[in-house]
């Protein structure tokens, strides 16, 4: 059974990760960012179902992509925090927060979506299981 | 004090042309995105399309894709939307919207023109 | 594209009365949600940001509540100036997408 404080630690890391997703959504969903109409013509795969921890597979396998499309928003006049480190940060949280004990075959929905569509909904994952676990 | 004003409305017959500006005063016009939004009589809003401070993206509603072409000149404060191919549907009042932040777009639109009717009959 | 709906689609009150409209999206929007409020023959007027947020100039009587797919607008005690319809609109992505709106009207 989970206990108070292991309770608490994966609280903290669903804080940490929903504010690192809010912060790519926000650093690309703006007035000044020049690459958006191209960076909405990449399609993301999202989850048939995200209900629980061991969902966030389905994340871990899109980072990848999520970094290069990231990558190609970079200019002058936009700038994520280097994305290489913010990806590796998430990537770490998602392995401790599904934990490697069972490998998950992650199941997709039919339809793809973009990266403002990807994000936000793992964003509402987050915010789903954070609440429950208030 | 911040103000923008459309122009360019009036009555036109289907398929044919109109260009509707809005000139803009009172804060840093080539710092915010602007929209178009339009609400057709004794009907809900609807919004029409965005551009970019500097024009680099532009977005519209399906509807207008191909036909509507929105487009800025920032040396003139200057918004404008060129309407082409129009339709009886798109009759409507037409107002340009300041953001109410350059760089978020939850701050929704906090200043709007008072509009500029357009009329689409044969 | 985002669906937004709003209930009720019109709503008779009194002066001091406290009213709340509901507005729904089709899919999560987070707090990307922003709401006006609209006269006759007048264009909208910027009432609450980010689904909580005051713009500033307007009474402490308004406020915006929730997250992801569900939201409120409350307006605590109904004043005569009040009387208006009201419309919710997310700003996650484009196209941006409008409620039908909300008539607010004298009982």
């Known amino acids: 059974a989970p206990t108070s404080s292991s309770t608490k630690k994966t609280q903290l890391q669903l804080e940490h990760l929903l504010l690192d997703l809010q912060m790519i959504l926000n650093g690309i969903n703006n007035y000044k960012n020049p690459k958006l109409t191209r960076m909405l013509t990449f399609k993301f795969y999202m989850p048939k179902k995200a209900t629980e921890l061991r969902h966030l597979q389905c994340l871990e396998e899109e980072l990848k992509p999520l970094e290069e499309v990231l990558n190609l928003a970079q200019s002058k006049s936009f700038h994520l925090r280097d994305t290489k480190d913010l990806i590796s940060n998430i990537n770490v949280i998602v392995l401790e927060l599904k934990g490697s004990e069972t490998t998950l075959m992650c199941e997709y929905a039919d339809e793809t979506a973009t990266i403002v569509e990807f994000l936000n909904r793992w964003i509402t994952f987050c915010q789903s299981i954070i609440s429950t676990l208030t | 004090q911040v103000q923008l004003v459309e122009s360019g409305g009036g009555v036109v017959q289907p398929g044919r042309s109109l260009r509707l500006s809005c000139a803009a005063s009172?804060?840093?016009?080539?710092?915010?995105?602007m929209h178009w939004v339009r609400q057709a009589p004794g009907k809900g809003l609807e919004w029409v399309a965005v551009?970019?401070?500097?024009?680099?993206?532009?977005f519209y509603v399906d509807s207008v894709k191909g036909r509507f072409t929105i487009s800025r000149d920032n040396s003139k404060n200057t918004l404008y939307l060129q309407m082409n191919s129009l339709r009886a549907e798109d009759t409507a009042v037409y107002y340009c919207?300041?953001?109410?932040?350059?760089?978020?777009?939850?701050?929704?639109?906090?200043?709007w023109g008072q509009g500029t009717t357009v009329t689409v009959s044969s | 594209d985002i669906q937004m709906t709003q209930s009720p689609s019109s709503v008779s009150a009194s002066v001091g009365d406290r009213v709340t409209i509901t507005c729904r999206a089709s899919?999560?929007?987070?707090?990307?949600l922003v709401w006006y409020q609209q006269k006759p023959g007048k264009p909208p007027k910027l009432l609450i940001y980010?689904?909580?947020s005051l713009q500033n100039g307007v009474p402490s009587r308004f406020s915006g509540s929730g997250s992801g797919t569900d939201f409120t607008l409350t307006i605590s005690s109904l004043q005569t100036e009040d009387f208006a319809t009201y419309y919710c609109?997310?700003?996650?992505?484009?196209?941006?997408?409008f409620g039908p709106g909300t008539k607010v009207e004298v009982k």
């Open positions: 919207a300041r953001p109410g932040s350059d760089y978020y777009f939850y701050y929704g639109m906090d200043v």
């Open positions: 009172g804060f840093t016009f080539s710092s915010y995105g």
């Open positions: 551009i970019w401070y500097d024009g680099s993206n532009k």
């Open positions: 899919q999560g929007i987070s707090n990307w």
């Open positions: 980010a689904a909580s």
């Open positions: 609109q997310q700003a996650l992505s484009f196209p941006w997408t």
